[in-house]
């Protein structure tokens, strides 16, 4: 059928709560593509009726809520004028009693459900919530060992739980809870997070600073090669990830097939008080679909983007 098959890693999911997965892969960024979700190679697409428990919402597949029988392989087909990608996503639903203290975490949980706090530092946990804009998320409540977290060492800030002066006792099982509203109905999202601790120096609560880019546009001709550096200052011995992402996906993963856009090797220079890191992004050939798309440089909790734009027409050529 002429579609390129792409296999995503397995997702482990908790039953009886909402779940959403966004189908993102080039060239989904232009308006000239159609996205259709299917289950288990069925010829019948997933419903687009918002009242359906499982339905397609723009590029997302949305489960309201996910149920035990929903495990399986889902395909998202992205059709462009000259291209077709079929993305296979294996969803495994498990029953998890987050308050079952006999279970120490879960094997093969995705990384966002395994987080690390740095002993003696001010650090934070993140509640990862990936839902389409039709889903309205309420304030987040945080729990440890099934008890709501209180105390002056803990502060809730948007999707993060800030923990000051982390101690060994802060390790263990956490959960973040949020009420999701969709089409007037309310659902509970409860994400369990296995939290381990380390003495190794973290970033000490400081936020990496992205020197460049600055959420700016770059004029670039179609078809040219472009290399853009992301310059970041951060504390020595920090443990922050520095990377380029597009549509919330690492560029190397996003362009895994064509390798047309790649992240470069990170380099750094050491100064007395901080390190200066550089990680570049290379566009081997700028294509039309790249324009107007934010390419994000991430460094820990910091992010900044560049956006490519076509140069203004040079009327002197006429």
């Amino acid at each position: 059928d002429g579609c390129n098959d792409i296999f995503m890693k397995n997702e482990m999911l908790s039953a009886s709560q909402p779940f959403a997965f966004n189908c993102t892969f080039p060239p989904i960024t232009s308006g000239e593509v159609s996205v259709t979700w299917y289950k288990n190679s069925s010829k019948i697409p997933v419903s687009k009726i918002i009242q359906s428990r499982i339905h397609q919402d723009e590029t997302w597949i949305l489960f309201l809520p996910m149920e035990w029988g929903d495990s399986g392989v889902y395909q998202c087909v992205i059709k462009g004028r000259d291209s077709c990608h079929r993305i296979h996503v294996n969803l495994t639903v498990f029953e998890k009693q987050w308050c079952d203290t006999s279970v120490k975490g879960l094997p093969n949980l995705s990384d966002e459900y395994k987080q690390i706090l740095h002993l003696g530092k001010d650090d934070s946990l993140t509640c990862h919530l990936h839902f389409p804009k039709s889903c309205i998320l309420g304030p987040i409540k945080w729990y440890k060992d099934c008890n709501e977290i209180t105390g002056e060492r803990f502060t809730v800030l948007e999707t993060r739980l800030l923990v000051s002066n982390v101690s060994a006792e802060d390790r263990g099982n956490y959960a973040c809870q949020v009420i999701l509203t969709h089409s007037g109905k309310q659902y509970e999202v409860l994400n369990g997070i296995t939290v381990s601790i380390t003495e190794r120096a973290g970033y000490g609560g400081s936020v990496p600073k992205i020197i460049y880019p600055k959420n700016n546009s770059i004029e670039v001709q179609l078809g040219t090669t472009l290399i853009v550096d992301c310059n970041i200052t951060d504390t020595k011995d920090n443990t922050n990830l520095r990377c380029w992402r597009v549509n919330n996906t690492l560029v190397d993963d996003y362009y895994n097939e064509s390798k047309r856009i790649r992240e470069g090797v990170e380099t750094h220079a050491s100064f007395r008080e901080y390190n200066l890191y550089t990680v570049n992004i290379t566009f081997l050939e700028v294509k039309m679909e790249d324009y107007g798309l934010p390419f994000m440089c991430h460094a820990g909790v910091s992010a900044a983007y560049i956006m490519l734009q076509l140069p203004a027409p040079d009327f002197r050529a006429y």
Partner: antibody
Framework: QVQLQESGPGLVKPSQTLSLTCTVS??????GYWNWIRNHPGKGLEYI?????????YYNPSLKSRVTISRDTSKNQYYLKLSSVTAADTAVYYC??????????????WGQGTLVTVSS | DIQMTQSPSSLSASVGDRVTITCRAS?????MYWYQQKPGKAPKLWIY???NLASGVPSRFSGSGSGTSYTLTISSLQPEDFATYYC?????????FGQGTKLEIK
């Protein structure tokens, strides 16, 4: 069950580069700290460095100019390269990881170790 | 660098003896980790966060200490306890080990 397995040549010539692979099963290297440690014959343990789940690396300053730790997440492997080796680098090399009782620094899982001899 | 000095370097003792191994750090450390190693084998985590016994470690072992002085104690030595014990700190990089204490049968 988390398992680690070191592999690589057991004999390296002086001035060459020592290259070892640690293959991990039962856990993903995109979570936690992945360490290299060595044990000189008849001497104690020496911490070489680690690669963090984010890709960040830390090296013992005494080896920093010669050591590189990298990884391949698709193979769930991480690597040690030690350049310009001398006889003093002859040792049993271990890969290890923590996470026991949610403590990343408690190195609970170790490979069986691989002896690397530097000799011409 | 924080230097870790274990004493004694070697120790001959008999089954049933009470044995104490000391680890001194050149600067304050927050926690101590202890490993047991037998010849030809990889080290095993023995005690973590100063006083917590790893899985399978008999209760005759205990760990204590703070600041610059930490101890591993065996209340009644058993034949399987003869091995080399290493302390390690993570408070400050580089993450240093002690030179080891070899526990031998008298």
């Amino acid at each position: 069950q988390v398992q680690l397995q070191e592999s690589g040549p057991g004999l390296v010539k002086p001035s060459q580069t020592l290259s070892l692979t640690c293959t991990v099963s039962g856990a993903s290297i995109t979570s936690g700290y992945w360490n290299w440690i060595r044990n000189h014959p008849g001497k104690g343990l020496e911490y070489i460095g680690y690669i963090y789940y984010s890709g960040y690396t830390y090296y013992n300053p005494s080896l920093k100019s010669r050591v590189t730790i990298s990884r391949d997440t698709s193979k769930n492997q991480y690597y040690l390269k030690l350049s310009s080796v001398t006889a003093a680098d002859t040792a049993v090399y271990y890969c290890a990881t923590g996470g026991y009782d949610y403590v990343e620094d408690a190195l609970y899982y170790w490979g069986q170790g691989t002896l690397v001899t530097v000799s011409s | 660098d924080i230097q870790m000095t274990q004493s004694p370097s070697s120790l001959s003792a008999s089954v049933g003896d009470r044995v104490t191994i000391t680890c001194r750090a050149s600067s304050n450390v927050r926690y101590m980790y202890w490993y047991q190693q037998k010849p030809g084998k990889a080290p095993k985590l023995w005690i973590y966060l100063t006083s917590n016994l790893a899985s399978g470690v008999p209760s005759r072992f205990s760990g204590s200490g703070s600041g610059t002085s930490y101890t591993l104690t065996i209340s009644s030595l058993q034949p399987e306890d003869f091995a080399t014990y290493y302390c390690q700190q993570y408070t400050t990089s580089p993450y240093t080990f002690g030179q080891g204490t070899k526990l031998e049968i008298k």
